[in-house]
Interface confidence: medium
């Protein structure tokens, strides 16, 4: 009696199941009690000897490529051996690599967590994912895993993380890069500093006083509000960041506390108060302002 090994499918793709069947065309396995064993190269597979002429392999991988055969043994201990069958496991090259961010859109608050998710639409086996920062490509990290997605995490985003990123996937057929993704790090404003600028050391009534408010950190645009005591004098915008100024024509009523507030939609911060006093110097006829 002759024995044949049949693999179904005969050209499996990585990750897919394969059924090995030990066939005896001129002998019904019911005619005699047979035990079956399947081999790859020199190693027995699965449970070893079994009464089933089939062996189900849940997932085949590239390294499972090899020469397979089966043996059948009767109760009388006669062993039949099939001819070897070469099974080549097919690897699908990676294709359509994309990079996505969490949070979506690539906008993240300073100090928050950023995840760069690299995905492939196609590809089997061990896929190496690599993440790069900047168009020049500083290699951040690599991961090799049997999945179509992998993640690179920045637990606490800093201002210096604002850059373009891309990822590359590779499973042996050459690297496939994703497109560039821009990351914007949104920074809440720091506490602003209020400075008073007068045309001379001792400003007089009717002089123009410049109130300059500046938050040293914070994502633009920044809106600045100016206050005398708790009365709003007005607002100024700094579309590209930096500070903003508000001009005031001085009168005697302008003595008191001044402050400013910076707001960029990620939180507001108020400056320390600056006090202005009108003084009358000895022998002088006009009022002067000191801060």
């Amino acid at each position: 009696a002759e024995l044949f090994l049949i693999a179904s499918p005969s050209h499996p793709t990585e990750g897919s199941p394969v059924t090995l069947t030990c066939k005896m065309p001129f002998l019904q396995s019911s005619d005699a009690q047979f035990q079956f064993c399947f081999f790859r190269d020199t190693r027995a597979l699965g449970p070893g000897w079994s009464s089933s002429p089939k062996l189900q392999i849940a997932a085949m991988w590239k390294e499972d490529t090899g020469s397979y055969w089966c043996e059948a043994q009767t109760m009388a201990s006669k062993v039949l051996r099939s001819r070897r069958s070469q099974i080549n496991v097919h690897r699908v090259p990676v294709a359509d690599v994309s990079l996505e961010t969490q949070p979506p859109g690539g906008q993240v608050m300073e100090g928050d967590r950023l995840v760069l998710i690299c995905s492939v639409a196609m590809g089997t086996g061990d896929i190496t994912f690599l993440w790069y920062k900047g168009a020049v490509g500083l290699n951040l990290q690599s991961k090799t895993q049997r999945s179509l997605t992998a993640e690179y995490e920045i637990p606490s985003v800093r201002e210096s993380d604002a850059e373009q990123y891309y990822c590359v996937a590779e499973n042996g057929y050459g690297p496939s890069p994703s497109g560039l993704v821009s990351i914007t790090v949104r920074i809440p404003v720091s506490r602003p500093i209020l400075m008073l600028r007068a045309p001379r050391a001792q400003a007089a009534v009717e002089d123009v006083l410049e109130l300059h408010c500046e938050a040293l950190r914070g994502s633009p645009p920044i809106l600045y509000w100016f206050y005398h005591e708790d009365i709003t004098l007005g607002s100024r915008s700094a579309p590209s960041g930096g500070g903003a100024s508000f001009n005031l024509s001085l009168t005697e009523e302008h003595s008191g506390n001044y402050s400013c507030e910076a707001n960029n939609g990620l939180g507001a911060q108020r400056s320390e108060a600056v006090t202005l006093n009108f003084t009358v110097p000895t022998g002088a006829r006009s009022n002067h302002l000191t801060s």
Partner: antibody
Framework: QVQLVQSGAELVKPGASVKVSCKAS????????MHWVKQAPGQGLEWIGR????????KYNEKFKSKATLTVDKSTSTAYMELSSLRSEDTAVYYC??????????WGQGTLVTVSS | DIVMTQSPDSLAVSLGERATMNCKSS????????????LAWYQQKPGQSPKLLIY???TRESGVPDRFSGSGSGTDFTLTISSLQAEDVAIYYC????????FGQGTKVEIK
């Protein structure tokens, strides 16, 4: 431009070992797997094995498993192949080659290893 | 291993004429999952390294003249040089990369 520059020809005695180098430039070394191919005098091409420069993981043709050892030095973008227990039948030109789109798109100039007493 | 067999072993063609060579694999190199044939063609001139001409059986490598074309699917493949030039004198190898790479024995192209 992409270049793979191999070390010079070697004349070695039977039983000795030799280490062939392949310096890559013009591309990101860790992104492309490096393969090695043998060509005996007047013969065809024979695949030896490959290495992933990123992880250092390698795979070999069964025939060369006890003959060749593949390594990389990421800091210098250099791949190495060490051939051991050399015999006359190991006399050949050895090529390093980069793989892209499955195929070997760039090749080194080849290193002739001559085994003779 | 997948065995690659090339024919003919050598080929003499007049300048400007068509040169055709074949490559047969012991197993199919076409996979339904991505409809790709895992086959490449290389040119090797005397004293030089091999040069990639064609990959995925029919995709021409950049910089390769369009007189070179690859065709075929499954187990039978063809490399055609539509109009042979003097600089095309070389040995041409096919290679499969469905499994660990194996090469054909080569076809030598000469001028008649």
């Amino acid at each position: 431009q992409v270049q793979l520059v191999q070390s010079g020809a070697e004349l070695v005695k039977p039983g000795a070992s030799v280490k062939v180098s392949c310096k890559a430039s013009g591309y990101t070394f860790t992104r492309y797997w490096m393969h090695w191919v043998k060509q005996a005098p007047g013969q065809g091409l024979e695949w030896i094995g490959r290495i992933d420069p990123n992880s250092g993981g390698s795979k070999y043709n069964e025939k060369f498993k006890s003959k060749a050892t593949l390594t990389v030095d990421k800091s210098t973008s250099t791949a190495y192949m060490e051939l051991s227990s050399l015999r006359s039948e190991d006399t050949a030109v050895y090529y390093c080659t980069r793989v892209n789109s499955g195929a070997m798109d760039y090749w080194g100039q080849g290193t002739l290893v001559t085994v003779s007493s | 291993d997948i065995v690659m067999t090339q024919s003919p072993d050598s080929l003499a063609v007049s300048l400007g004429e068509r040169a055709t060579m074949n490559c047969k694999s012991s197993q199919s190199l076409l996979y339904s999952s991505n409809q790709k044939n895992y086959l490449a063609w290389y040119q090797q001139k005397p004293g030089q390294s091999p040069k990639l001409l064609i990959y995925w059986a029919s995709t021409r490598e950049s910089g390769v003249p369009d007189r070179f074309s690859g065709s075929g699917s499954g187990t039978d493949f063809t490399l055609t040089i539509s109009s042979l030039q003097a600089e095309d004198v070389a040995i041409y190898y096919c290679q499969q990369y469905s499994n660990y790479p194996t090469f054909g024995q080569g076809t030598k192209v000469e001028i008649k």
